[in-house]
Interface confidence: medium
Amino acid sequence: SAPGEDEECGRVRDFVAKLANNTHQHVFDDLRGSVSLSWVGDSTGVILVLTTFHVPLVIMTFGQSKLYRSEDYGKNFKDITDLINNTFIRTEFGMAIGPENSGKVVLTAEVSGGSRGGRIFRSSDFAKNFVQTDLPFHPLTQMMYSPQNSDYLLALSTENGLWVSKNFGGKWEEIHKAVCLAKWGSDNTIFFTTYANGSCKADLGALELWRTSDLGKSFKTIGVKIYSFGLGGRFLFASVMADKDTTRRIHVSTDQGDTWSMAQLPSVGQEQFYSILAANDDMVFMHVDEPGDTGFGTIFTSDDRGIVYSKSLDRHLYTTTGGETDFTNVTSLRGVYITSVLSEDNSIQTMITFDQGGRWTHLRKPENSECDATAKNKNECSLHIHASYSISQKLNVPMAPLSEPNAVGIVIAHGSVGDAISVMVPDVYISDDGGYSWTKMLEGPHYYTILDSGGIIVAIEHSSRPINVIKFSTDEGQCWQTYTFTRDPIYFTGLASEPGARSMNISIWGFTESFLTSQWVSYTIDFKDILERNCEEKDYTIWLAHSTDPEDYEDGCILGYKEQFLRLRKSSVCQNGRDYVVTKQPSICLCSLEDFLCDFGYYRPENDSKCVEQPELKGHDLEFCLYGREEHLTTNGYRKIPGDKCQGGVNPVREVKDLKKKCTSNFLSPEKQNSKSN
């Protein structure tokens, strides 16, 4: 149904009084500068707010910051700046919040020029207390927590030293010099690149990749001639310079760098780049940039070893290294990703895949929308989604697409309906089935957020004028109510709700401006009284994900299995609650050719599910590098898609014979690796 407040919309009873009783204003005794907000822990209600204000003086910039803490989801704040000795905190480092529910926080302070090292403030009790610690180095990066042990921290210094702490920043030790990049791996392992001849920039392509599994007691060189490295899922990737020229190739390891295989991906030149778009324990999406300044490249999807890649999408929009791509993982439905392609006429179009990159299609035109001026045929067009690229181009798009794992099937995004993305003012669209179908939800650009696992959607109009109205929907965006949360409009700067979309609180941030001053202000609205009762069994309905034809036996089969979910009925106005767990029921599907990707040396012609041999490889033995050995591949062209759980059906057989010969093209063979101890 069309959005709005028509007769069909069941209004929430007495909502104004209910929300008025649950609206909490907090005015910050602060000059307006910048504000950053962090949630500490999950379901703790603890929020830290750091406000900073720079006063440009003639000779130098004088800075002032204040730290505030809330323990009731933002309804009340307490000024705790005295806990950090009224020190100016460096906002570029942000607030380093510990993993999981560790309750750990690290703030990095600004120190005067002549000091020996930096200063941090540490808390391990959800910011109730802080300990000041002077560092033996000046940090270059934010402190990084080990995902496995929040007491272990690493940081790079301005002198390119790699520093590690084993007691949550109390004591620090420099474990290596000349370090360019360092990352935590699994099991408290640290991977880092080092330079030999002067600087990271000068040695790019000649870096060494090192590993320590014991926080710096011993080291192993696991790669040479390294340009860069990255971690994704269970894969370690290194981009390695070729012997003969300036090209480089991706090598991959699944055993923390002990053995490497060359990924079957195109090599790239100096001006090109690789980018890991998404990775999990099953597979990886890899973008390979095209030669020249084209602004696009190709997406490849990997097999389960990260070695064999299938071409997934051509002309994938990705501007420059570290630039903008619209690639988005739709977390509310398994296997769904959205991104943009740059078509031959330089227009940008949105594509969606429902099967983890197997096939890409245009987004279906919303039923309640007309095709815009970009459409050649007014009856045939599709929805195009605005994401990072549109935001970078300063289009009137305040937010990227939004989805949440526990709000099953819901995707909210700005978009336009035509043959390509339009520069006109976008509207907001919603899908309740993971991107298969879309409906216009709100006219014009908005900020939006999901509360109570999808039970409530909240939106605020994006406007240059001050605002005092919030919109909310209890039926997945079909119908909207408006609530005036303050008499005095504020200049809106952002919506904040607890990550994970389980909360029923939303904070509206902004500032008030008067003749003399401007101040930060937040309004926190608790929707608990709108959703008066807890949801019961009758409030949920069975929904088959990826369903396109409910009668069809294979309907809903994606990656070898289908999933039934219990979804909240749109008509039910009730609380899923903070402890809500998505109820899903998987069942195995029969294997079809769609459950297999094409093996090395094979490809799928367009609109065909069969894999055929690449013409240039016909009749040749297929040989490729695996763990530094040359392998002979006997295959009928198929390999099971990573994460696919199908059984029975078709079963293409596959066999790999080890030729026991060394790969001449593998620069990361084990012989070139060495170890040393401190």
């Epitope: 069809d552 036996y553 069942s587 029969l590 079809s592 029975g648």
Partner: antibody, heavy 118, light 107 residues
Amino acid sequence: EVQLLESGGGLVQPGGSLRLSCAASGFTFSTYGMSWVRQAPGKGLEWVAIISSGGSYTYYSDTVKGRFTISRDNSKNTLYLQMNSLRAEDTAVYYCSRSSSHWYFDVWGQGTLVTVSS
Amino acid sequence: DIQMTQSPSSVSASVGDRVTITCHASQGISSNIGWLQQKPGKAFKGLIYHGTNLKDGVPSRFSGSGSGADFTLTISSLQPEDFATYFCVQYAQFPYTFGQGTKVEKR
């Protein structure tokens, strides 16, 4: 009315062959997965084989794999089970049943008796 | 293969009684279970799918519960036409497997 009607059962010697048919009516046959299930005298139900709605994909229980072939002709709304190398333990009433993406084994035929004996 | 253990194998009951039949799966099957009814000389009939969902046209006195490995079929008030044999079936994984059946007979 939704109906399934099996035929083709009878007495056959060990090592012999038989082809069962299941005629469907009252629903869109081509969109449903179809199964064969059997019940030996005095025993429980045993699922035998399934075929996908388009007919491209099949799955068999280990006890019949390599000997039985499930197939379908959507133009004739008919499901088949070709049984070769029959054994005494294949003696049972054979039922055909339909499955959709939501429903498994919701509609059944009356069954046809297959007796394997010398 | 997943084994489905159904109990009891038979139950004697009178019209109006509450009858409960259980099925235990040898491993977790989420809610991928159906319940079937077989009357002598009649075709099998599907009653419940996905553990708890009543097939259209099935009286509301039939209900299903459970998730994971333990499931129950309940007939809240037995009617004359309910004397039959009931089977559970799992369809979480191939090969699909059935319970041994529970015969509900007149006391």
